[in-house]
């Protein structure tokens, strides 16, 4: 049966050859494969000025395979598409295009942004933050005693970091001034010795507005260990007023 089909073919194509290469069922010296063995896909390859028929187990990049009753053929994907399931569904776009709903676009639609890694249009992700945690205790230079005015801080977490076009995160730290009932420090809550307190210049990279971390005391009743000369106390009170500010961190 194959031989008779071959003879019929030979009458139509004077150059049909019986010794076909690879997966060809019929072929000619000039045109290459004319038909393929079962399950193989027929494709045309351009060689110089002419097209040669080839039989492939899967279609090359930029083509997809379709099975018809009379031929299994490689069909070209759309011009902007590198890999596709069929004409309607591209799975990978050519360079410079972004994949969206199986189509290749040069710009992503409103509400979406281009992911230059996957070359797809993706949803814009906005920043999400948690609720504020409770305010920290009111402190001054790390102490919760021995003063009247101090600062308290609260923080919140970033739940979702934003994508490139997403809304930036709001501040995740807040500091504010606070007032406490003036209370005397207990024995174990003493400040550091005077000489450790005398650092005037901030370290390199330290903000001048940062709340100082040396432990000063403003106690109403002086006990021997806490005594400072009146001059120093006045000077330190002025410094404290200048340095107590609100700090916010933006991400």
């Amino acid at each position: 049966q194959n031989a008779s089909r071959g003879r019929r073919q030979r009458r139509m194509h004077p150059n049909v050859s019986q010794g076909c290469q690879g997966g060809c069922a019929t072929c000619s010296d000039y045109n290459g494969c004319l038909s393929c063995k079962p399950r193989l896909f027929f494709a045309l390859e351009r060689i110089g000025m002419k097209q040669i028929g080839v039989c492939l187990s899967s279609c090359p990049s930029g083509y997809y395979g379709t099975r018809y009753p009379d031929i299994n053929k490689c069909t070209k994907c759309k011009a902007d598409c590198d890999t596709c399931f069929n004409k309607n569904f591209c799975t990978k776009c050519k360079s410079g295009f972004y994949l969206h709903l199986g189509k290749c676009l040069d710009n992503c639609p409103e509400g979406l942004e281009a992911n230059n890694h996957t070359m797809e249009c993706v949803s814009i992700v906005h920043c999400e933050v948690s609720e504020w945690n409770p305010w920290s205790p009111c402190t001054k230079k790390g102490k919760t005693c021995g003063f009247k005015r101090g600062t308290e801080t609260r923080v919140r977490e970033i739940i979702q970091h934003p994508s490139a076009k997403g809304n930036l995160c709001p501040p995740t730290n807040e500091t504010r001034k606070c007032t406490v009932q003036r209370k005397k420090c207990q024995k174990g809550e003493r400040g550091k010795k005077g000489r450790e307190r005398k650092r005037k210049k901030p370290n390199k990279g330290e903000s001048k507005e940062a709340i100082p971390d040396s432990k000063s005391l403003e106690s109403s009743k002086e006990i021997p260990e806490q005594r400072e000369n009146k001059q120093q106390q006045k000077k330190r009170k002025v410094q404290d007023k200048q340095k107590s500010v609100s700090v916010s961190t933006v991400h």
């Epitope: 997809y64 099975r67 018809y68 399931f85 069929n86 004409k87 309607n88």
Partner: antibody, heavy 116, light 107 residues
Framework: EVQLVESGGGVVQPGRSLRLSCAAS????????MAWVRQAPGKGLEWVAT????????YYRDSVKGRFTISRDNSKNTLYLQMNSLRAEDTAVYYC?????????WGQGTMVTVSS | DIQMTQSPSSLSASVGDRVTITCRAS??????LAWYQQKPGKSPKLLIY???SLIHGVPSRFSGSGSGTDFTLTISSLQPEDFATYFC?????????FGQGTKLEIK
């Protein structure tokens, strides 16, 4: 947006003819193979016929071969199904669809009832 | 022609259930299998192609698996809008054939 709108259905006596049309919009009609798929009341889906993008080749299921003819007019973006010698078992909703391995886009269907 | 046999033909389930529908081909169809969803009075809608590739916009609770002759469609957690009839289709050979359908109903 892809739209396929079928028309031409109705009640017809056995042995008579009917011509279904499918108007396409929202895509390049001349690039796509098109098909007719039918569904008898309360039954499954059954592929009927396919015509390739340029109209040069057509394929039919065995039970309709010689009775049905699928054709297209790419200048009018329209697909047709000429149904002759209709039988009771041809009673179904007829859908037109893009056919590219899968049936990606479907019309809303048109009902054909063959009854004496 | 390749016969496609779906089971079960109908199935009752509740919202939140995990559901599996199977489709068996009478011969090897490799990975040339698609799944469709059809709601009453509506045309079918393509959900999955090449066994497990989801059409864009189809929720990720839908998944497909299998190869050769045995295939499954799984819905991991049923939602009210998933109650419909599901069909498998092979496109490995002409004529392209469909399964008889699986009707998914609310328990």
């Amino acid at each position: 947006e892809v739209q396929l709108v079928e028309s031409g259905g109705g009640v017809v006596q056995p042995g008579r003819s009917l011509r279904l049309s499918c108007a396409a919009s929202g895509f390049t009609f001349s690039d796509y193979d098109m098909a007719w798929v039918r569904q008898a009341p309360g039954k499954g889906l059954e592929w009927v016929a396919t015509i390739i993008y340029d109209g040069s080749r057509t394929y039919y299921r065995d039970s309709v071969k010689g009775r049905f003819t699928i054709s297209r007019d790419n200048s009018k973006n329209t697909l047709y199904l000429q149904m002759n010698s209709l039988r009771a078992e041809d009673t179904a909703v007829y859908y037109c669809a893009t056919h590219d391995k899968t049936f990606d886009y479907w019309g809303q269907g048109t009902m054909v009832t063959v009854s004496s | 022609d390749i016969q496609m046999t779906q089971s079960p033909s109908s199935l009752s389930a509740s919202v939140g259930d995990r559901v599996t529908i199977t489709c068996r081909a009478s011969e090897d169809i490799y990975s040339d299998l698609a799944w469709y969803q059809q709601k009453p009075g509506k045309s079918p809608k393509l959900l999955i192609y090449d066994v497990n590739s989801l059409i864009h916009g189809v929720p990720s609770r839908f998944s497909g698996s299998g190869s050769g002759t045995d295939f499954t469609l799984t819905i991991s957690s049923l939602q009210p809008e998933d109650f419909a009839t599901y069909f498998c289709q092979q496109y490995d050979n002409y004529p392209n054939t469909f399964g008889q359908g699986t009707k998914l109903e609310i328990k």
